[in-house]
Interface confidence: medium
């Protein structure tokens, strides 16, 4: 026990002596952050001049503070021990390590391309002012149906699977453990809406049945085709869309 205690003391003395010798050999090692070892003044520690800093001790020079000019603005002022930090002026956002570049913001529903901000193409969205347009969630992959359609700015909202919603279908899937017994208010509301729609549709059909002779067959076919046509989103099909057809220069939509 006494022997190991002696060893520890001896080691400590050696380390302390080494540190003292090192500081005698290199007085600069004593200079703290925020100072530099001034060779012109007999190696004494001088504070960093204005607009410069040293973040570590023992430095022989201070570094010039970063300047946030142009599109950059100061996020954190330079101090004697730390560099200034910049971010970007409104309308731009940071890119690169330490915000080395500023990139233009776009609107939600757009993405920045080589040619500036362009609208997201059909089937994609961007809910931020930066980043790229991402494809809408494919609800069917999770066995769900689309409850709310997607837009350029928002993803689709997935709802219960179509099987869950057909009145006569008996579901084989057991209910989720967390769900309380009985139907949720949303499901009941949905069934009521569905029943009402079915009744209205039936009424509409019967009315049309009697008027078909007067109006002619073509009109009837047209009415029944209409609801199933894909809606044309004119706002996304103009030249401003970031997607191009394959034969055009930009290439297709990356989904």
């Amino acid at each position: 026990m006494g022997n190991s205690c002696y060893n520890i003391v001896a080691t400590l003395l050696l380390v302390l002596n080494f540190e003292r010798t090192r500081s005698l050999q290199d007085p600069c090692s004593n200079c703290p952050a925020g100072t530099f070892c001034d060779n012109n003044r007999n190696q004494i520690c001088s504070p960093c001049p204005p607009n410069s800093f040293s973040s570590a001790g023992g430095q022989r020079t201070c570094d010039i503070c970063r300047q946030c000019k142009g599109v950059f603005r100061t996020r954190k002022e330079c101090s004697s021990t730390s560099n200034a930090e910049c971010d970007c002026t409104p309308g731009f956002h940071c890119l690169g390590a330490g915000c080395s570049m500023c990139e233009q913001d776009c609107k939600q529903g757009q993405e920045l391309t080589k040619k500036g901000c362009k609208d997201c193409c059909f089937g994609t969205f961007n809910d931020q002012k930066r980043g790229i347009c991402r494809p809408w969630t494919n609800c069917s992959l999770d066995g769900k149906s689309v409850l709310v359609n997607g837009t350029k700015e928002r993803d689709v909202v997935c709802g219960p699977s179509p099987a869950d919603l057909s009145p006569g279908a008996s579901s084989v899937t057991p209910p989720a453990p967390a769900r309380e017994p009985g139907h949720s208010p949303q499901i009941i509301s949905f069934f009521l809406a569905l029943t009402s729609t079915a009744l209205l549709f039936l009424l509409f059909f019967l009315t049309l049945r009697f008027s078909v002779v007067k109006r002619g067959r073509k009109k009837l076919l047209y009415i029944f085709k209409q609801p199933f046509m894909r809606p044309v989103q004119t706002t996304q099909e103009e030249d401003g869309c970031s997607c191009r057809f394959p034969e055009e220069e930009e290439g297709g939509c990356e989904l």
Partner: antibody, heavy 127, light 106 residues
Framework: QVQLVESGGGVVQPGRSLRLSCAAS????????MHWVRQAPGKCLEWVAI????????YYADSVKGRFTISRDNSKNTLYLQMNSLKAEDTAVYYC????????????????????WGQGTLVTVSS | YELTQPPSVSVSPGQTARITCSGD??????AYWYQQKSGQAPVLVIY???KRPSGIPERFSGSSSGTMATLTISGAQVEDEADYYC??????????FGCGTKLTVL
């Protein structure tokens, strides 16, 4: 015409330091950002660092951050790379290259690229 | 983030050489092409996908479609034999090079 000439390469032991220089001529040096790019034997080109035209703002690749320091002396038309705590993986040909942008601080997003390069100087880190 | 290039491409003199570079950010970011002849400094031959610096022969052209950028040398000549590197930045602003394609003009 634009000319960039690197010097200061050589064989050095791991943990030691080396300082590379790049002498520029044929253009107004103080108007341009400058880069160092390196190429290890049989490997891809790797961007190392950039210093803006005014010498104040500097950025580094993660692989060299804290060990390498880029600097410039506009009065001497010279770019420097101080390399400390060198590792075997720092062995490469080091090129200095001019940034294409006339004034980096004009305040718009830019994609850096290099319009003129030097011939390179070989740094070998070996024990 | 990576830019992927074929290691080598071979053509006969007078033929068209095509060198590709693929990267996920290329639909949004420009591609740049550098030529490096043995023992020499790299030379910029195409910038911003398809622009040619002054002094670069007209047979060099560039294009970009989707995630693929292409350097085309129409009527390749023996003196075009070199390593060709593509370069771009990724969506975070990091600077990235491809690993190069060795063009052989047989």
């Amino acid at each position: 015409q634009v000319q960039l000439v690197e010097s200061g390469g050589g064989v050095v032991q791991p943990g030691r330091s080396l300082r590379l220089s790049c002498a520029a001529s044929g253009f107004t040096f103080s108007n341009y950002g400058m880069h160092w790019v390196r190429q290890a034997p049989g490997k891809c080109l790797e961007w190392v660092a950039i210093i803006w035209y005014d010498g104040i703002n500097k950025y580094y690749a993660d692989s060299v951050k804290g060990r390498f320091t880029i600097s410039r002396d506009n009065s001497k038309n010279t770019l420097y790379l101080q390399m400390n705590s060198l590792k075997a993986e720092d062995t490469a040909v080091y090129y200095c290259a001019r940034d294409q942008d006339y004034d980096i601080l004009t305040g718009y997003y830019k994609e850096d690229y290099f319009d003129f390069w030097g011939q390179g100087t070989l740094v070998t880190v070996s024990s | 983030y990576e830019l992927t290039q074929p290691p080598s491409v071979s053509v006969s003199p007078g033929q068209t050489a095509r060198i590709t570079c693929s990267g996920d950010a290329l639909p949004k970011k420009y591609a740049y092409w550098y030529q490096q002849k043995s023992g020499q400094a790299p030379v910029l031959v195409i910038y911003e996908d398809s622009k040619r610096p002054s002094g670069i022969p007209e047979r060099f052209s560039g294009s970009s479609s989707g995630t693929m950028a292409t350097l085309t040398i129409s009527g390749a000549q023996v003196e075009d034999e070199a390593d060709y590197y593509c370069y771009s930045t990724d969506s975070s602003g990091n600077r990235v090079f491809g690993c190069g394609t060795k063009l052989t003009v047989l």
